[in-house]
C-alpha cells in the first residue's frame, strides 16, 4: 500500500469537537502522533494554516467524502491512506463523545488507530493491537503499542534509527563552519541573505556577525526541503523558490495560495527539468536562471524569456562554471556565486571576478 | 500508461437490462476504487457508483438504487454495471472512472475511459 | 445532504482574458473540491484536486483556491484550447457545469 516518501510530516486539526477542550484535543492528537513517531523515523509537526499532510476534521454525516459517518456508535472515525488532497485526512464522528477518559469514545486512543491508517497501515488480526478493528478502551496511562503494531508500522518506515543510516540524514543539521560545506541556493530577502541547505536555512542579517539555522518548514510549513534555486524581487516583496519542475512565490515572507507551479510557465524548454540557480538583477529588470553549463536571462517585466538564451555560463561570465550551485546579488553591483564551497565575488559591470572566497565565509568561520 | 475501455452500451427497451463492461490496463486495478458516471445528452455530469478495491463497500446514486448493480472482477481487471428496469431518463454516455488506492474513496477521479452510449427508448 | 452551486453557467472570454469560475457547497467540505475541464465529445479530465493542487501535466494558468465552502478555478489568460466546460466536483456530487465559449 502506499507509504508517506518523507520523514517530516505535518498535520492540521481543522476544527475542535466541543466535547472536548481546545487544549485537550491538541495534546491528544500530538500524544497519538508521538506513539508512531516513537517507533520510527517519522517526525510530526502541528500547523495552524496552509496545506497539511493530515488534516484532522470532527465531522457528522456526509462531510465530504463517500464515507458518510452514522451517527453515535457504529463507526467511530476513518483515515484515508498516505497521498496528496484527502490522503492522510483523519475524520472523527462528531456525534461520538469525545473525552480524555474511559467515559464517551477516547480521543487519544481512537486517532492513534486512525493515524496508523493514515500512515499506511491496515487492520491487524491481533486483538491486542491499536489497529485491531473494533475499539476497546485501555488505560491511556500504560497504552503501548503491540508487537504487532510497531512490526507493521516499522515494516513500512524503518526504526527510529533508520534516518541515521541514510548517507546524507536529513534530520542533522550541517556543520556551519564546516569548509566543505555547499549551499542548494542563496537569495536575498530584504536586508537578509537566506542560505539554504537540505531542509534547513540559515538567516544572515546584513553586517551582523549573528545567524541562525531554521527549518525551512518552521517558516513555511507547505514548502519541501532541499530547495534549490532562489531569487528576490525586493521591489514587489516576491521571493521565488524552486525545487524539482515547481516553483513556489512567496510575497511579504508569506507562501502565496496556488503554488507550486510549473517551470515551464517561465517558458523553459521541456528538456529543463530543474533551475540550478536564479538571480534578479534590479538594475535590468531581469532574472537569470543557471542550468548545467547554460543561462536564460528572463524580461520580468513583460513576463517572458529574452530572445537568443541559452547561452553558456563560461562565455559570458568569465571565471565561472561550467555549472552552479547557488547565486545571489548584493551591493548594486555584485553577484555571488556559489561552486560546491566556494564563492566567488563577481562585479556584473567590470564583468569579471573580484574575489573567491569560501562559501560559509558570510558565517564569520 | 492508464486505459479504461467501456463497452456494452446500445439500444434497449424501457424495463430492459444491460451490462456495461470496464476493461483495465496500465495499471494494478485490484487496489484502487472504480467508480460509474454518465451523462445524459447535452447535460452535465452525474455520479452513479463506487465500488471498493475488493469488492466492498459500494454506492449508489439515490436515483439508480435498487435498479443497477456495480462489481468487479479483480482477476480480470474488470468493472462492470448491470443496469435493470432501465427507464428513458438513464439514456446516457456512461464513463469509468478511477479513483485512489486504500480502503476509503477519495471522489477523485483522476482517470476516466471515453465512454458508451446507453439509449433507452421503445 | 451536501450540494454544489456552480456559477456562471456559461461564460464568454477572449483568448489572453482571465476567466474565474466559482463553486459554492452548501456545507463544509474543507478542501475536498476537484475541477474538471470536458471538451465535446470527450471525456472529463481532472485539471485541479484538494481545490488547489494541479494535477500532472496541466498548464500552470489553472489554478484553484478556496476552502470550507467557496472554491474558484481560475484561468489567468486563457488560450484557445481553453474553451469547454468545466466542472466541480466533490464525492459523488458535481456542479452543473460552466461552459466557456469564444466571445
Known amino acids: 500500500g502506499p507509504v508517506w516518501r518523507k520523514h517530516y510530516i505535518t498535520y492540521r486539526i481543522n476544527n475542535y469537537t466541543p466535547d472536548m477542550n481546545r487544549e485537550d484535543v491538541d495534546y491528544a492528537i500530538r500524544k497519538a502522533f508521538q506513539v508512531w513517531s516513537n517507533v520510527t523515523p517519522l517526525k510530526f509537526s502541528k500547523i495552524n494554516t496552509g496545506m497539511a499532510d493530515i488534516l484532522v476534521v470532527f465531522a457528522r454525516g456526509a462531510h465530504g467524502d463517500f464515507h458518510a459517518f452514522d451517527g453515535k456508535g457504529g463507526i467511530l472515525a476513518h483515515a484515508f491512506g498516505p497521498g496528496s488532497g484527502i490522503g492522510g485526512d483523519a475524520h472523527f464522528d462528531e456525534d461520538e463523545f469525545w473525552t480524555t477518559h474511559s467515559g464517551g469514545t477516547n480521543l487519544f486512543l481512537t486517532a492513534v488507530h486512525e493515524i496508523g491508517h493514515s500512515l499506511g497501515l491496515g487492520h491487524s488480526s491481533d486483538p491486542k493491537a491499536v489497529m485491531f478493528p473494533t475499539y476497546k478502551y485501555v488505560d491511556i496511562n500504560t497504552f503501548r503499542l503491540s508487537a504487532d503494531d510497531i512490526r507493521g508500522i516499522q515494516s513500512l518506515y524503518g526504526d527510529p534509527k533508520e534516518n541515521q543510516r541514510l548517507p546524507n540524514p536529513d534530520n542533522s543539521e550541517p556543520a556551519l563552519c564546516d569548509p566543505n560545506l555547499s549551499f542548494d541556493a542563496v537569495t536575498t530577502v530584504g536586508n537578509k541573505i537566506f542560505f539554504f541547505k537540505d531542509r534547513f536555512f540559515w538567516l544572515k542579517v546584513s553586517e551582523r556577525p549573528k545567524t541562525s539555522v531554521n527549518l525551512i518548514s518552521s517558516l513555511w510549513p507547505t514548502l519541501p526541503s532541499g530547495i534549490e534555486a532562489a531569487y528576490e524581487i525586493e521591489a514587489r516583496n516576491q521571493v521565488f523558490l524552486f525545487k524539482d519542475d515547481k516553483y513556489w512565490l512567496i510575497s511579504n515572507l508569506r507562501p502565496e495560495p496556488n503554488y507550486p507551479k510549473s517551470i515551464h510557465s517561465f517558458g523553459f524548454p521541456n528538456f529543463v527539468k530543474k533551475i540550478d540557480a536564479a538571480v534578479f538583477n534590479p538594475r535590468f529588470y531581469r532574472t537569470y536562471f543557471f542550468v548545467d553549463n547554460q543561462y536564460w536571462r528572463y524580461d520580468e517585466r513583460r513576463q517572458m524569456m529574452d530572445p537568443g538564451y541559452p547561452k553558456l555560463i563560461t562565455k559570458n561570465f568569465q571565471g565561472i562554471g561550467p555549472k552552479i550551485d547557488a547565486v545571489f546579488y548584493s551591493k548594486n553591483k555584485y553577484y555571488y556565486f556559489f561552486q560546491g564551497s566556494n564563492q566567488f565575488e563577481y562585479d556584473f559591470l567590470l564583468q569579471r571576478i573580484t574575489k573567491t572566497l569560501k562559501s560559509n565565509s558570510w558565517f564569520g568561520c | 500508461e492508464v486505459q479504461l475501455l467501456e463497452s456494452g452500451g446500445g439500444l434497449v427497451q424501457p424495463g430492459g437490462s444491460l451490462r456495461l463492461s470496464c476493461a483495465a490496463s496500465?495499471?494494478?486495478?485490484?487496489?484502487?476504487?472504480m467508480h460509474w458516471v454518465r451523462q445524459a445528452p447535452g447535460k452535465g455530469l452525474e455520479w452513479v457508483s463506487g465500488?471498493?478495491?475488493?469488492?466492498?463497500?459500494?454506492f449508489y446514486a439515490d436515483s439508480i438504487k435498487g435498479r443497477f448493480t456495480i462489481s468487479r472482477d479483480n482477476s480480470k481487471n474488470t468493472l462492470y454495471l448491470q443496469m435493470n428496469s432501465l427507464r428513458a431518463e438513464d439514456t446516457a454516455v456512461y464513463y469509468c472512472?478511477?479513483?485512489?488506492?486504500?480502503?476509503?474513496?477519495?471522489?477523485?477521479?483522476?482517470?476516466w475511459g471515453r465512454g458508451t452510449l446507453v439509449t433507452v427508448s421503445s | 445532504d451536501i450540494q454544489m452551486t456552480q456559477s456562471p453557467s456559461s461564460l464568454s472570454a477572449s483568448v489572453g482574458d482571465r476567466v474565474t469560475i466559482t463553486c459554492r457547497a452548501n456545507?463544509?467540505?474543507?478542501?475536498?473540491l476537484n475541477w474538471y475541464q470536458q471538451k465535446p465529445g470527450k471525456a472529463p479530465e481532472l485539471l485541479i484536486y484538494?481545490?488547489?493542487s494541479l494535477q500532472s501535466g496541466v498548464p500552470s494558468r489553472f489554478s484553484g483556491s478556496g476552502s470550507g465552502t467557496d472554491f474558484t478555478l481560475t484561468i489567468s489568460s486563457l488560450q484557445p484550447e481553453d474553451f469547454a466546460t468545466y466542472y466541480c466536483?466533490?464525492?459523488?456530487?458535481f456542479g452543473q457545469g460552466t461552459k466557456l465559449e469564444i466571445k
Open positions: 465500488i471498493g478495491p475488493s469488492g466492498g463497500p459500494t
Open positions: 472512472a478511477k479513483d485512489i488506492r486504500g480502503p476509503y474513496s477519495s471522489g477523485l477521479f483522476d482517470y
Open positions: 484538494a481545490a488547489s
Open positions: 496500465g495499471f494494478t486495478f485490484s487496489p484502487y476504487w
Open positions: 466536483q466533490q464525492a459523488g456530487i
Open positions: 456545507q463544509s467540505i474543507y478542501t475536498y
